[in-house]
């Protein structure tokens, strides 16, 4: 048993029938030494009376909050949450398995820039009853310090016939530097709970590896004379990082005709600009990527070629 | 030629070929971003390479002030990394293809470090560490993490030249 | 962010022939070798050609040596499998991947860190 925040403890149990759960001693938190009794949630019903009290937890029903009194009178609460380990392996039934990059990815990060602040998301079919706490560090063992806030509602999405809920925090590391080499991992910690279940999700990644350029703004067309070819141009995103000269984007060029089926025509270039052969109700549409290592590209930017 | 007493590098060539290490390091182990930096075991070969750190002036404002120091550095990571892609972890089985990229990596490290550092003058160099897995898959696996880690290196280098040939080069 | 497209599939005569093509986007395969893998239905995926990144030097599994060929035109992005005498047991969907060095196709490397396409079916039956 371990205490998870003030007067909450999480009991971790090795699940599988008739396993013979854990012994746990509760101690009110009083200097009162007699007629102190304890009773589970909202029941009356006394279980056990002196100033400890042992229980044998093995499921849920012996989980929730405990408290003891004097006199009517409440002295002390302990709120005991399961954390299951089924087979060895902890049980991770509150959030959605998202499958991408690779099984087993419970929670996605990404960050826009070099500057130390990212994003991080996950995906739960529960609506209730449900709470998280994000910790992050640089390092685990000389951990440097990254201030997370709180994890929001960001989308909520029906998939079939069930209702699919994203939550997303912010993070942003207090020394970020954004020019250097990283050599050791952001390390993202999140605790779910929901209802008397624990559970507790890593990830573990260099900002590098994460990031993912906004879309190139102000994608404009100029018709040249007397061609079909057009010049694309566009600009290097707000959010990217700074200077350009040091911190430089790639770029993909794509024409696209109006069926998806018809053959995509791509150009790469390092300038921000590029000229193309514009079809009639094609459109253009261009993304970026670090120029110096292969992180994810950025979202389309798009404009229609007539 | 960034040599004692401060004189420049040749920036554009140092950008041109910075630029085709990122290509042929990427090409050496493409898809990295998707290892799971937990299941990789702490090894100490890729614990002992040399980053480019803070305050190692390879930002932009350090690089203004004095280039010297990062150029260093990077020249001190050329030739760890050099020496690692020469070492009997990648020259062991399993044996590289003979049009390796490995092997064009190899010899570009090598002549960018030969672009920053001319006969006759020395910076300090780091010792390599003296691990050599005794299984393939052991090798295998070491020589990822090593790409890995180089390819993290020479993206921050290639940063460095495209800056300095843009804003540094006379 | 390397994206590989698989065509050329379909259905075929046993001894018949079919030629599948493997389009890169994203990335220049200039420097990369690429590596043919099939999957049968309710079996495991198994290597079966594997071509370096020059074109030169190429790799096959047993069972397909002499029947099978691996080019590539890195003008186009391009990697091909010509796969001729083909039998009912080549029935399979076939994926083509980067395989550095060829290490997956050897045998030596079994890992999910290599970029795959989304696969191409081949049946061959009379």
């Known amino acids: 048993i371990w205490e998870l925040k003030k007067d909450v403890y999480v009991v971790e149990l090795d699940w599988y029938p008739d396993a013979p759960g854990e012994m746990v001693v509760l101690t009110c938190d009083t200097p009162e030494e007699d007629g102190i009794t304890w009773t589970l949630d909202q029941s009356s019903e006394v279980l056990g009376s002196g100033k400890t009290l042992t229980i044998q937890v093995k499921e849920f029903g012996d989980a929730g909050q405990y408290t003891c009194h004097k006199g009517g009178e409440v002295l002390s609460h302990s709120l005991l949450l399961l954390h299951k380990k089924e087979d060895g392996i902890w049980s991770t039934d509150i959030l959605k398995d998202q499958k991408e990059p690779k099984n087993k990815t419970f929670l996605r990060c990404e960050a826009k820039n070099y500057s130390g602040r990212f994003t991080c998301w996950w995906l739960t079919t529960i609506s209730t009853d449900l709470t998280f706490s994000v910790k992050s560090s640089r390092g685990s063992s000389d951990p440097q310090g990254v201030t997370c806030g709180a994890a929001t509602l960001s989308a909520e999405r029906v998939r079939g016939d069930n209702k699919e809920y994203e939550y997303s925090v912010e993070c942003q590391e207090d020394s970020a530097c954004p020019a250097a080499e990283e050599s050791l991992p952001i390390e993202v910690m999140v605790d779910a709970v929901h209802k008397l279940k624990y559970e507790n999700y890593t990830s573990s990644f260099f900002i590098r590896d994460i990031i993912k350029p906004d879309p190139p703004k102000n994608l404009q067309l100029k018709p040249l004379k007397n061609s079909r070819q057009v010049e694309v141009s566009w600009e290097y995103p707000d959010t990217w990082s700074t200077p350009h000269s040091y911190f430089s984007l790639t770029f993909c060029v794509q024409v696209q005709g109006k069926s998806k089926r018809e053959k995509k025509d791509r150009v790469f270039t390092d300038k921000t600009s590029a000229t193309v052969i514009c079809r009639k109700n094609a459109s253009i549409s261009v993304r970026a990527q670090d120029r110096y290592y292969s992180s994810s590209w950025s979202e389309w930017a798009s404009v229609p070629c007539s | 030629r960034a040599v004692p007493g401060g004189s420049s590098p040749a920036w554009t060539q140092c950008q041109q070929l910075s630029q085709k290490l990122c290509t042929l390091a990427w090409s050496a182990h493409p898809l990295v971003g998707h290892m799971d930096l937990r299941e990789e075991g702490d090894e100490e070969t890729t614990n002992d390479v040399p980053h480019i750190q803070c305050g190692d002036g390879c930002d932009p404002q350090g690089l203004r002030d004095n280039s010297q120091f990062c150029l260093q550095r990077i020249h001190q990571g050329l030739i760890f990394y050099e020496k690692l892609l020469g070492s009997d972890i990648f020259t062991g089985e399993p044996s590289l293809l003979p049009d390796s990229p490995v092997g064009q990596l190899h010899a570009s490290l090598l002549g960018l470090s030969q672009l920053l550092q001319p006969e006759g003058h020395h910076w300090e160099t780091q010792q390599i560490p003296s691990l050599s897995p005794s299984q393939p898959w052991q090798r295998l696996l070491l020589r990822f993490k090593i790409l890995r880690s180089l390819q993290a290196f020479v993206a921050v280098a290639a940063r460095v030249f495209a800056h300095g040939a843009a804003t540094l080069s006379p | 962010e390397v994206q590989l497209l698989e065509s050329g599939g379909g259905l075929v005569q046993p001894g018949g022939s079919l030629r599948l093509s493997c389009a890169a986007s994203g990335f220049t395969l200039d420097y990369l070798a690429i590596g043919w893998f099939r999957q049968a239905p309710g079996k495991g995926r198994e290597g079966v050609s594997c071509?370096?990144?020059?074109?030169?030097?190429?790799y096959y599994a047993d069972s397909v040596k002499g029947r099978f060929t691996i080019s590539r035109d890195n003008s186009k992005n391009t990697v091909y499998l010509q796969m001729n005498s083909l039998r009912p047991e080549d029935t399979a969907v076939y994926y083509c991947?980067?395989?550095?060095?060829?290490?997956?196709?050897?045998?030596?490397?079994?890992?999910?860190?290599?970029?795959w396409g989304q696969g191409t079916l081949v049946t061959v039956s009379s």
């Open positions: 991947a980067t395989d550095p060095e060829c290490y997956r196709v050897r045998g030596y490397y079994n890992g999910e860190y290599d970029y």
């Open positions: 071509v370096s990144s020059s074109g030169q030097y190429t």
